[in-house]
Interface confidence: low
């Protein structure tokens, strides 16, 4: 493998063995430079498995506002605009990283936390269990 | 809003106005205790807008492995199992936070970074532009 030497400009760490706490720069670098901010803003309405977006706000978390998708129907919208219950609307979930203030109400110390969020919905063929 | 007093047990910070660099405890707290790890593992195949998952690996980032969804078709799968081009498969995208080593190869200093990932696909009615 390639030998990557330790950068001499690294901050000092009190415990060289195994840092439990690290320094994180909150000046967020955004890699999404050329993305259209409205990229999927109307998919929630146009989808055959439409969803509503619910605001989840927590001042002790960063980011403090997360939008959660909730599927509108158990079934999917068919070509006639009706709900077809032979298909299922299901949430697409993703684990994301957030920062949680710890101790609470501290402006400059956090703990990493993993949370599961529903990003949107998709229409799937149901799994049918046949009873013998 | 509710005034939350500053916790007297907070670590000292040099810049009380707005911490650009904060301390983060790396003992990750996982809130997804009761989630089924296979929760949406087969949706990518069962969806009417199926997708493939592509592995994006970067050892200098946390999480180092991110799975990116790529829709399999321009159209959606109809009841006969054929691709219907009167509908569109579109990616559902989400901005997520990741940590990147900064300076590179330092064990205990990071920068927050926002990246846009495609989590899955959904089937939408296309926007039809009528030419006068």
């Amino acid at each position: 493998g390639i030998t990557i030497p330790r950068n001499p400009g690294c901050p000092n760490s009190e415990d060289k063995n195994f840092p439990r706490t690290v320094m994180v720069n909150l000046n967020i670098h955004n890699r999404n430079t050329n993305t259209n901010p409205k990229r999927s803003s109307d998919y929630y309405n146009r989808s055959t498995s439409p969803w509503n977006l619910h605001r989840n706000e927590d001042p002790e978390r960063y980011p403090s506002v997360i939008w959660e998708a909730k599927c509108r129907h158990l079934g999917c919208i068919n070509a006639d605009g009706n709900v077809d219950y032979h298909m299922n609307s299901v949430p697409i979930q993703q684990e994301i990283l957030v920062l949680r203030r710890e101790p609470p109400h501290c402006p400059n110390s956090f703990r990493l936390e993993k949370i599961l969020v529903s990003v949107g919905c998709t229409c799937v063929t149901p799994i049918v269990h046949h009873v013998a | 809003g509710i005034t939350i007093p500053r916790n007297p047990g907070c670590p000292n910070s040099e810049d009380k106005n707005f911490p650009r660099t904060v301390m983060v405890n790396l003992n990750i707290h996982n809130r997804n205790t009761n989630t089924n790890p296979k929760r949406s593992s087969d949706y990518y195949n069962r969806s009417t807008s199926p997708w493939n998952l592509h592995r994006n690996e970067d050892p200098e980032r946390y999480p180092s492995v991110i799975w990116e969804a790529k829709c399999r078709h321009l159209g959606c799968i109809n009841a006969d199992g054929n691709v219907d081009y009167h509908m569109n498969s579109v990616p559902i995208q989400q901005e997520i936070l990741v940590l990147r080593r900064e300076p590179p190869h330092c064990p205990n200093s990071f920068r927050l970074e926002k990246i846009l990932v495609s989590v899955g696909c959904t089937c939408v009615t296309p926007i039809v532009h009528h030419v006068a």
């Epitope: 493998g1 439990r20 | 180092s64 940590l99």
Partner: nanobody, 119 residues
């Protein structure tokens, strides 16, 4: 699919030695720090040792320093832990873990190998 398979555990007398191995697959082994983690009966997980990508830097928890040696062979996608001067308190299930850039988070580990130190 990421897989980590440990081997080499067993029953050994105090003062004895064992060499644990871990075979890795499903990821770019040479790109990641690797770890040995252990869990003693009735206790929580304890980090034991870390080795950087190229093997040049190793870290140890204080009570194994000088007795345990972590090493790796990137050509074979393998991680090792040489354990000498074993003590009863080293009895535990030893896990090999794939490192992330965050040194306290292991996203994958194996099924573990039991090391019992007893006379």
């Amino acid at each position: 699919e990421v897989q980590l398979v440990e081997s080499g555990g067993g029953l050994v007398q105090p003062g004895g030695s064992l060499r644990l191995s871990c075979a890795a697959s499903g990821f770019t082994f040479s790109s990641y720090s690797m770890y040995w983690v252990r869990q003693a009966p009735g206790k929580g997980l304890e980090w034991v040792a870390e080795i950087k990508q190229d093997g040049s830097v190793q870290y140890y928890v204080s009570d194994v320093k000088g007795r345990f040696t972590i090493s790796r062979d990137n050509a074979k996608n393998s991680l090792y832990l040489q354990m000498n001067s074993l003590r009863a308190e080293d009895t535990a299930v030893y896990y090999c873990a794939k490192g992330e850039i965050l040194p306290l988070y292991f996203d994958y580990w194996g099924q573990g190998t039991l090391v019992t130190v007893s006379s």
